[in-house]
């Protein structure tokens, strides 16, 4: 968690002299208790918004805007703190309106916004504003708190931000999957444009469960650059299990701004459709079935084979 | 491919407790939260809270406050959840499910039945 | 706690047909609402996450509508697949809550 770079953090507006401040998210007051003390914030909204650093990256960061409730105790409001927790992590950052002066009655409801703080790609948050001073142990909360999930990098507006180009968000591998026979599966996609290896990892699953019953993984070495952009192509060797028909292919990409953390793409090919009329049940049931091979899933005496070609 | 497998099905007598696990698999169990939800049979879902494998810290819903403990052993990448002080109206199918707002990956549902 | 509400609890649509289902939150959750499909003996799968963003996987002809209050889930053309439980979940503030429910039938 940090804060964007970009001006000079203002919270003043007219009729309010205001300074940000960094805060250690323990405010004094928490300390020294005051016997009057302001109400809680209205109407907290948190939004996704985006902004560009000096430097010209683009962040999201969460804009953060509430209101003040109409009553008597904005004449105790000293300020306010914003508080960013991400929820994983357990990693807080805040930040300190102080107000330079006291707020008097206005004829439209007080509105304060903030839109500083940077968030991460698919990462969930709680923001709280606590109005201050903060009240006495035994006093009525005079903080609002909500939640907050940021998009992850296959959202329109997010792909275009520094953090998920970093990762690979503009490659669009356009993947095709198709099952030639019960034994073998076509993979095409396109390469990106850049001298790196790919891995394809192949989990296929039984028609309508989510366990495993067979794994692959097929390494695919860095493309030339008269490559770059063209499709690929490989065939992939499927185990012969009855009923293991529900193949997702993953494609992990290596890319140098993201090493082993890039974005994966991935397509899933189903199993074929059902027909109507029931299979008619035989007079006898046989006692017991033929076993279909001893293990569910690849070890390394048994590997799949597979070719790949690049397609110019 | 991200997976959830949880333990198998338990009976219990009211009053007992019980420990479902959840193995994760796919994506690093550190880099994201675990929440729990149970589904009582026919109904719908139920938020219980959830666990940071990366901090440790966790939020339970008041309702389970006292009664349930969340943890982790990023070791061999398994959470688990604890009821304690079972009653009838205890069974359900508990999930485990990835991260703590919006869960985006689910596992597969372990039945827990309380009866005397 | 903010109370979901789902409606109708039952919906008979025949395949091919748009079906709508509706998702009213007791106050204002912005756009911090999740939708998820559960099929008979299987764990819910989350469909839609920030009220219109699809899950990774999710088919474009599933849809949302709204904030606030007051949400949609539009699947503009009913697949077989697609015959199934509906669930809304509000994440705006703790605790989670989901919605009752809403049983897709075939007509």
């Known amino acids: 968690l940090r804060l964007l770079d970009h001006r000079a953090l203002v919270c003043s507006q007219p009729g309010l002299n205001c300074t940000v401040k960094n805060s250690t998210c323990l405010d004094d007051s928490w300390i020294h208790p005051r016997n009057l003390t302001p109400s809680s914030p209205k109407d907290l909204q948190i939004q996704l918004h985006f902004a560009h650093t000096q430097q010209g990256d683009l962040f999201p960061v969460a804009h953060i805007e509430w209101t003040l409730q109409t009553d008597a105790s904005i004449l105790y409001l000293e300020g306010a703190e914003l508080s960013v927790l991400q929820l994983n992590t357990n990693e807080r950052l805040c930040v300190k309106f102080q107000f330079l002066s006291m707020l008097q009655h206005h004829r439209k409801r007080w509105r304060f916004s903030f839109s500083h703080f940077v968030v991460d790609p698919g990462q969930e948050y709680e923001v709280t504003v606590h109005h201050l001073p903060k009240p006495i142990p035994d006093g009525d909360p005079n903080h609002q708190s909500k939640n907050f999930l940021v998009p992850d990098c296959e959202h329109a507006r997010m792909k275009v931000t520094t953090p998920c180009m970093s990762s690979g968000s503009l490659w669009d591998p356009n993947i095709t999957v198709e099952t030639l026979d019960t034994q073998h599966l076509r993979v095409d996609f396109t390469l990106w444009n850049e001298s790196t290896h790919y891995q394809i990892l192949l989990t296929s699953f039984p028609h309508m469960e989510n366990h495993s019953c067979f794994e692959h993984m097929h390494h695919i070495p860095a493309p030339r650059p008269e490559e770059f952009h063209q499709r690929s192509n490989v065939t992939l060797t499927l185990r012969n299990l009855k009923g293991c028909c529900r193949h997702q292919v993953q494609i992990q990409p290596f890319f140098s701004s993201c090493l082993n953390d890039c974005l994966r793409h991935s397509a899933t090919v189903s199993c074929p459709e059902m027909p109507d009329t029931p299979e008619p049940i035989p007079d006898y049931m046989p006692l017991w079935e033929p076993r279909s091979g001893s293990s569910d899933y690849k070890d390394d005496d048994d590997k799949g084979s597979s070719h790949h070609h690049h397609h110019h | 491919q991200v997976q959830l497998v949880q333990s198998g099905a338990e009976v219990k007598k009211p009053g007992a407790s019980v420990k479902v696990s959840c193995k994760a698999s796919g994506y690093t169990l550190t880099s994201y939260g675990i929440s729990w939800v149970r589904q009582a049979p026919g109904q719908g879902l139920e938020w219980m809270g959830w666990i940071s494998a990366y901090s440790g810290n966790t939020k339970y819903a008041q309702k389970f406050q006292g009664r349930v403990t969340m943890t982790t052993d990023t070791s061999t990448s398994t959470a688990y959840m604890e009821l304690r002080s079972l009653r009838s109206d205890d069974t359900a199918v508990y999930y485990c499910a990835r991260r703590q707002l919006a869960l985006d990956y689910w596992g597969q549902g372990t039945l827990v039945t309380v009866s005397s | 706690e903010i109370v979901m509400t789902q409606s109708p609890a039952t919906l008979s649509v025949s395949p091919g047909e748009r079906a709508t289902l509706s998702c009213r939150a007791s106050?204002?959750?912005?756009?911090?609402l999740a939708w998820y499909q559960q099929k008979p003996g299987q764990a819910p799968r989350l469909l839609i996450y920030g009220a219109s963003t699809r899950a990774t996987g999710i088919p474009a002809r599933f849809s949302d509508n709204g904030s606030g209050t007051e949400f949609t889930l539009t699947i503009s053309s009913l697949q077989s697949e697609d015959f199934a439980v509906y669930f809304c979940q509000q994440y705006d503030t703790w605790p989670l809550t989901f919605g009752g429910g809403t049983k897709v039938e075939i007509k």
């Open positions: 106050q204002s959750i912005s756009s911090n």
